[in-house]
């Protein structure tokens, strides 16, 4: 288990970010609605490289589009509240990457669907958590 308190804090924040992303993906996968087809037409920018915490800048820059797409899904069977959820993710991302970062995100040439986008960032969180555990 992580030894330093800063590592423990980082791990906990990454676990929370991971859970938030998994909750969104689960909500979308469970979503039986014509709006889902429309959601899948929205394109997200993917990071060229995502191996360090500073690369979360690329996720931060896509949070507004993510919120907009999730707003489409609102119904009695979609229980994620986009504003609260994205606000929580934003807070975690800022804490993890640091608000002082000057890192400029580089994006891949190909865009992705919301499902591919979420899977990419879920994998990112899982891979960093694994190195901390």
């Amino acid at each position: 288990a992580p030894t330093s308190s800063s590592t423990k804090k980082t791990q906990l924040q990454l676990e929370h970010l991971l859970l938030d992303l998994q909750m969104i993906l689960n909500g979308i996968n469970n979503y039986k609605n014509p709006k889902l087809t429309r959601m899948l037409t929205f394109k997200f920018y993917m990071p060229k490289k995502a191996t360090e915490l500073k690369h979360l800048q690329c996720l931060e820059e896509e949070l507004k589009p993510l919120e907009e797409v999730l707003n489409l899904a609102q119904s009695k069977n979609f229980h994620l509240r986009p504003r609260d959820l994205i606000s929580n993710i934003n807070v975690i991302v800022l804490e993890l990457k640091g608000s002082e970062t000057t890192f400029m995100c580089e994006y891949a040439d190909e865009t992705a669907t919301i499902v591919e986008f979420l899977n990419r960032w879920i994998t990112f969180c899982q891979s960093i958590i694994s190195t901390l555990t």
């Epitope: 998994q22 993906l25 689960n26 509240r81």
Partner: antibody, heavy 113, light 107 residues
Framework: QVQLVQSGAEVKKPGASVKVSCKAS????????MHWVRQAPGQGLEWMGI????????SYALKFQGRVTMTRDTSTSTVYMELSSLRSEDTAVYYC??????WGQGTLVTVSS | DIQMTQSPSSLSASVGDRVTITCRAS??????LAWYQQKPGKAPKLLIY???SLDEGVPSRFSGSGSGTDFTLTISSLQPEDFATYYC?????????FGQGTKVEIK
């Protein structure tokens, strides 16, 4: 110490609803997401869903979607799981768990006419 | 959904025996696997997380290994208090899923 204390056993009729509570103590309530898991008599463990206690947003297993509602009261550090349109196969022990290493003692819900 | 398959579903062993329980995932879950012990009338207790990390306070006779799709829980020398049902669980993706359980009984 860190603990989760759940409400007592319930007996319900088919078609009714049940609301189980889970009160957290010994840690910052909003710091850990809460899962609900159930276990039918003599059966295995089944994940029902998750709630983020600070903001209260949720995500449910497809099997329970439309019947389950998870809520929380931050003032009392309590999470609730309500299951509606109960049927006999919902007879089970319902557990809340925070971070998977801390579990409530379980609440037996019996559905019988 | 990711299916988790445990084997055997039950086993009989004696105190001091080395016991091995396996768990197979229907797709790769990296090391996002946990093992739980459950005794009758009690809540599950976390033994191992991240496939091989021992939770706090868990005796060192318990160990976990594996990654990808195949995982193992080993009890190096079975003690009287270890007779229980053991479950594996994946948290790689939602919905979280559990194995069907392995009951370890006294021979």
């Amino acid at each position: 110490q860190v603990q989760l204390v759940q409400s007592g056993a319930e007996v319900k009729k088919p078609g009714a609803s049940v609301k189980v509570s889970c009160k957290a103590s010994g840690y910052t309530f909003t710091r850990y997401y809460m899962h609900w898991v159930r276990q039918a008599p003599g059966q295995g463990l089944e994940w029902m869903g998750i709630i983020q206690p600070r903001a209260g947003y949720t995500s449910y297993a497809l099997k329970f979607q439309g019947r389950v509602t998870m809520t929380r009261d931050t003032s009392t550090s309590t999470v609730y799981m309500e299951l509606s349109s109960l049927r006999s196969e919902d007879t089970a022990v319902y557990y809340c768990t925070s971070g998977w290493d801390v579990w409530g003692q379980g609440t037996l819900v019996t559905v019988s006419s | 959904d990711i299916q988790m398959t445990q084997s055997p579903s039950s086993l009989s062993a004696s105190v001091g025996d080395r016991v091995t329980i396996t768990c197979r995932a229907s797709q790769s879950i990296s090391t996002w696997l946990a093992w739980y012990q459950q005794k009758p009338g009690k809540a599950p207790k976390l033994l191992i997380y991240a496939a091989s990390s021992l939770d706090e306070g868990v005796p060192s006779r318990f160990s976990g290994s594996g990654s990808g799709t195949d995982f193992t829980l080993t009890i190096s020398s079975l003690q009287p208090e270890d007779f229980a049902t053991y479950y594996c669980q994946q948290s790689y993706s939602f919905p979280v899923t559990f194995g069907q359980g392995t009951k370890v009984e006294i021979k």
